[in-house]
């Protein structure tokens, strides 16, 4: 791994191993200032594997609202605008980190949690298992 | 919003507003214990808008390694296996939360940061601007 020299101005902590509990500043720094959110906002409709976005809300989680994609069709839209069932629309999934209130209902104490979210859909050739 | 009764067992903190700095347990709870990672691992090759995965490493960030998708073609793969430039391969992007060491090089002090990552690619009908 990469060894980083420790900054002498770090907050004190007993960190015998990699710290189990750390301090986190929730003032989010957004690195995406130049991105145009409208750019990808219509892909869900224009894709050959279009998807619907479903709101998933959990007040015990930060962020409390996550949008989940579900593919609109089993197949993919062909050049004629019809669904082609020789192909499959499948969700593209990603593991993301969220903060889970722990103990529950505590405003200032969290635990990192990994969840799997579907971000959008893509069109793939199906795996067909041929029988001898 | 949803009001959650505060748990009396919460750690003490001065929380005049929504806390700026909170305690976070880094022992990650993985909600995806049943998921089979092999399932989606080959979509990047089987998609009509295939992509390559690029490793993005930053020791000052947690997680330090993030995989970024880059679409392999401008167009999409058609039924004959050729690239069709009447369609576009585009990245599906998602804003995710990461932890950024702050001050730098500190092992136990972080700030939440939002970054935009490309998770995979989808095939879309291009937007054509007609000239009068």
């Amino acid at each position: 791994g990469i060894t980083i020299p420790r900054n002498p101005g770090c907050p004190n902590s007993e960190d015998k191993n990699f710290p189990r509990t750390v301090m986190v500043n929730l003032n989010i720094h957004n690195r995406n200032t130049n991105t145009n959110p409208k750019r990808s906002s219509d892909y869900y409709n224009r894709s050959t594997s279009p998807w619907n976005l479903h709101r998933n809300e959990d007040p015990e989680r930060y962020p409390s609202v996550i949008w989940e994609a579900k593919c609109r069709h089993l197949g993919c839209i062909n050049a004629d605008g019809n669904v082609d069932y020789h192909m499959n629309s499948v969700p593209i999934q990603q593991e993301i980190l969220v903060l889970r209130r722990e103990p529950p209902h505590c405003p200032n104490s969290f635990r990192l949690e990994k969840i799997l979210v579907s971000v959008g859909c893509t069109c793939v050739t199906p795996i067909v298992h041929h029988v001898a | 919003g949803i009001t959650i009764p505060r748990n009396p067992g919460c750690p003490n903190s001065e929380d005049k507003n929504f806390p700026r700095t909170v305690m976070v347990n880094l022992n990650i709870h993985n909600r995806n214990t049943n998921t089979n990672p092999k399932r989606s691992s080959d979509y990047y090759n089987r998609s009509t808008s295939p992509w390559n995965l690029h490793r993005n490493e930053d020791p000052e960030r947690y997680p330090s390694v993030i995989w970024e998708a880059k679409c392999r073609h401008l167009g999409c793969i058609n039924a004959d296996g050729n690239v069709d430039y009447h369609m576009n391969s585009v990245p599906i992007q998602q804003e995710i939360l990461v932890l950024r060491r702050e001050p730098p090089h500190c092992p136990n002090s972080f700030r939440l940061e939002k970054i935009l990552v490309s998770v995979g690619c989808t095939c879309v009908t291009p937007i054509v601007h007609h000239v009068a």
Partner: antibody, heavy 118, light 108 residues
């Protein structure tokens, strides 16, 4: 009014063949997704096969290579050709129409019983 | 192959709320449907695409699907709701339809 009526079931010996029919009315079979689902006596539902509106077909692993789904557009009828029948194929066979999206089945026939026994 | 899990039986008193769960690996990324089957009858679709109710199905039937679990909720359960209930999804990995083993709902 949408109706589906299966026929062709009966007693058949192991290794034998049978053809089930499903006569549809109130809609066009060829422009819909049509499926066969079976239910062994006292057991749950098991999907068998589907033919999508574009003619693409899929089968459950348990019947692949033995069963063939087809449709006759002129008769507005769905078929299931069952070959090399086994005792474990004994069940009530339902014909079902898939919803537009294809994710579920919105209309079901009354079923026809197939008994495979020597 | 993809599998769905349901409790074999659920009991509820008339007028109370019955909840029937259906679990599957990352089921929330797929659409879940629910069917009601009474003895000697064909299945009837009661919920499709997680939470949509076909016309003719009473408003007391509702559905949700998130994470690894889909839930069918029957509020103000009536004696006529006593039946077997099956959840179902389409597995995009195998291009196959999958049914749960079924749950027998008893109205006490």
């Amino acid at each position: 009014q949408v109706t589906l009526k299966e026929s062709g079931g009966g007693l058949i010996q192991p290794g034998g063949s049978l053809r089930l029919s499903c006569a549809a009315s109130g809609f066009t079979v060829s422009s819909n997704h049509m499926s066969w689902v079976r239910q062994a006596p006292g057991k749950g539902l098991e999907w068998v096969s589907i033919i999508y509106s574009d003619g693409t077909t899929y089968y459950a692993d348990s019947v692949k290579g033995r069963f063939t789904i087809s449709r006759d557009n002129s008769k507005n009828t769905l078929y299931l050709q069952m070959n090399s029948l086994r005792a474990e194929d004994t069940a009530v066979y339902y014909c079902a129409r898939g919803r537009n999206s294809g994710f579920s089945f919105d209309y079901w026939g009354q079923g026809t019983l197939v008994t495979v026994s020597s | 192959s993809y599998e769905l899990t349901q409790p074999p039986s659920v009991s509820v008193s008339p007028g109370q709320t019955a909840s029937i769960t259906c679990s599957g690996d990352d089921l929330g990324s797929k659409y879940a449907s629910w069917y009601q089957q009474k003895p000697g009858q064909s299945p009837v679709l009661v919920i499709y695409q997680d939470d949509q109710r076909p016309s003719g199905i009473p408003e007391r039937f509702s559905g949700s699907n998130s994470g690894n679990t889909a839930t069918l909720t029957i509020s103000g359960t009536q004696a006529m709701d006593e039946a077997d209930y099956y959840c179902q999804t389409w597995d995009y990995w195998t291009s196959k339809y999958v049914f749960g083993p079924g749950t027998k709902l008893t109205v006490l």
